[in-house]
């Protein structure tokens, strides 16, 4: 089973130090700020979840060097900023979406030796990323979505 | 196989500095996810969490006790150093060097997966 | 510090008997505690870690469960070789902190 920690008040102040090893935001339908960085120096478990992100600000990550995993399910994200998508050690937890290409892509260019990319349905299944992205984000099929989104997903 | 072994004085005398030695094996100090920590028992006593070092170099100590304590690593030679001034006869235990490793199958965690044996330290005038 | 309270401090158990620890967190730790079995002059190993999964090799008696501030370790059927103080600890903030023990005797 995976670790589990206390969700946090939905009144984040993004100036305190967080000294947990593990932090969860899930649900709390926060706003990412993009020009400051979540100070953070312990945690390596960071709950995301179902915060309706589009984008994940990598300023907001710059400063989480123990982070391993990055769970941000149940978010309509449209876009995975490079610098995140390059460190190679982040376990990103994330919705089948066509948006995550990129991530894919990078890692793929960048990253040697790592366990085949994942990512989950609406049912909690896991796929393997890259079929996903072969089967549900063609270009013909990715422009016939407009955003690329794999729109039954969401 | 992963073996991981302290070394010490055995007897030093209160005000002294204690030094010791985690010498490691099977595994890099320099891995992502990696690091060691010092953990300490007294006779017949519970765990006492002393600091940890990761891999990066970075560093967490007890703040019980931060003045006192100072952890480093070599990793050419595969050793992590403690060091403990102003020793008293409260400092007498067994102190342990134990390893987190990143685990990549049940991720998020955080545990101390091998211990060393452990060297017995007596603060004694 | 999260202090972490061990009940009871020792036990004595009969072969096949069913044996629980108890560890009490003084604020939510979620499910950053391990359990860790020391047998007589030796060094602790883990048999719990996450609050409720078992370390590999470790034998499948043993159970951990418990989240937030209150965890168990049971033993289902206690073996001979069980004799050893079981200590718990918490790894969800700084400075981890264990729990003092609890002793295991056999009958």
């Known amino acids: 089973l995976e670790p589990s920690c206390t969700v946090s008040s939905a009144d984040v102040d993004w100036n305190a130090e967080f000294s947990a090893t593990c932090l969860n935001f899930s649900g709390l339908s926060l706003s990412l700020p993009h020009n400051q960085s979540l100070r953070a120096s312990n945690v390596i478990l960071l709950d995301l979840s179902g915060n309706g992100l589009r984008e994940l600000p990598v300023t907001f990550f710059a400063h989480l060097q123990k982070l391993e995993v990055l769970n941000v399910l149940r978010n309509p994200l449209s876009r995975v900023d490079g610098a995140l998508a390059a460190r190679c050690d982040l376990d990103l937890q994330a919705d089948c979406n066509c948006a995550l290409e990129s991530w894919h892509d990078i890692r793929r260019d960048n990253c040697s030796g790592q366990k085949p990319l994942l990512c989950w349905d609406t049912t909690s299944s896991q796929h393997n990323l890259s079929a996903f992205l072969e089967v549900s984000c063609a270009p013909g099929l990715a422009s016939a979505t407009g955003s690329g989104h794999h729109h039954h997903h969401h | 196989q992963i073996t991981l072994k302290e070394s010490g004085p055995g007897i030093l005398q209160p005000s002294q500095t204690l030094s010791l030695t985690c010498s490691f094996s099977?595994?890099?100090?320099?891995?992502?996810?990696?690091?060691v920590s010092w953990i300490r028992q007294p006779s017949g006593k519970g765990l006492e969490w002393l600091a940890h070092i990761y891999w990066d170099d970075d560093k967490r100590y007890n703040p019980s006790l931060r003045s006192r304590l100072t952890i480093s690593k070599d990793t050419s030679s595969n050793q992590v150093v403690l060091k403990l001034t102003n020793v008293d006869t409260a400092d007498t235990a067994t102190y342990y060097c134990a390893r987190r490793a990143r685990d990549y199958y049940n991720s998020g965690h955080w545990y101390f997966d091998v211990w060393g044996a452990g060297t017995t330290v007596t603060v004694s005038s | 510090d999260v202090v972490m309270t061990q009940t009871p401090k020792s036990m004595s158990m009969s072969v096949g008997e069913r044996v629980t620890l108890s560890c009490k967190a003084s604020e939510n730790v979620g499910t950053y505690v391990s359990w860790y079995q020391q047998k007589p002059d030796q060094s602790p190993k883990l048999l719990i870690f996450?609050?409720?999964n078992r370390y590999t090799g470790v034998p499948d008696r043993f159970t951990g469960s418990g989240s937030a501030t209150d965890f168990t370790l049971t033993i289902s059927s206690v073996q001979a070789e069980d004799l050893a103080d079981y200590h718990c600890g918490q790894t969800y903030s700084f400075p981890f902190t264990f729990g003092s023990g609890t002793k295991l005797e056999i009958k």
């Open positions: 099977g595994f890099s100090l320099t891995t992502s996810g990696m690091g």
């Open positions: 996450g609050a409720s």
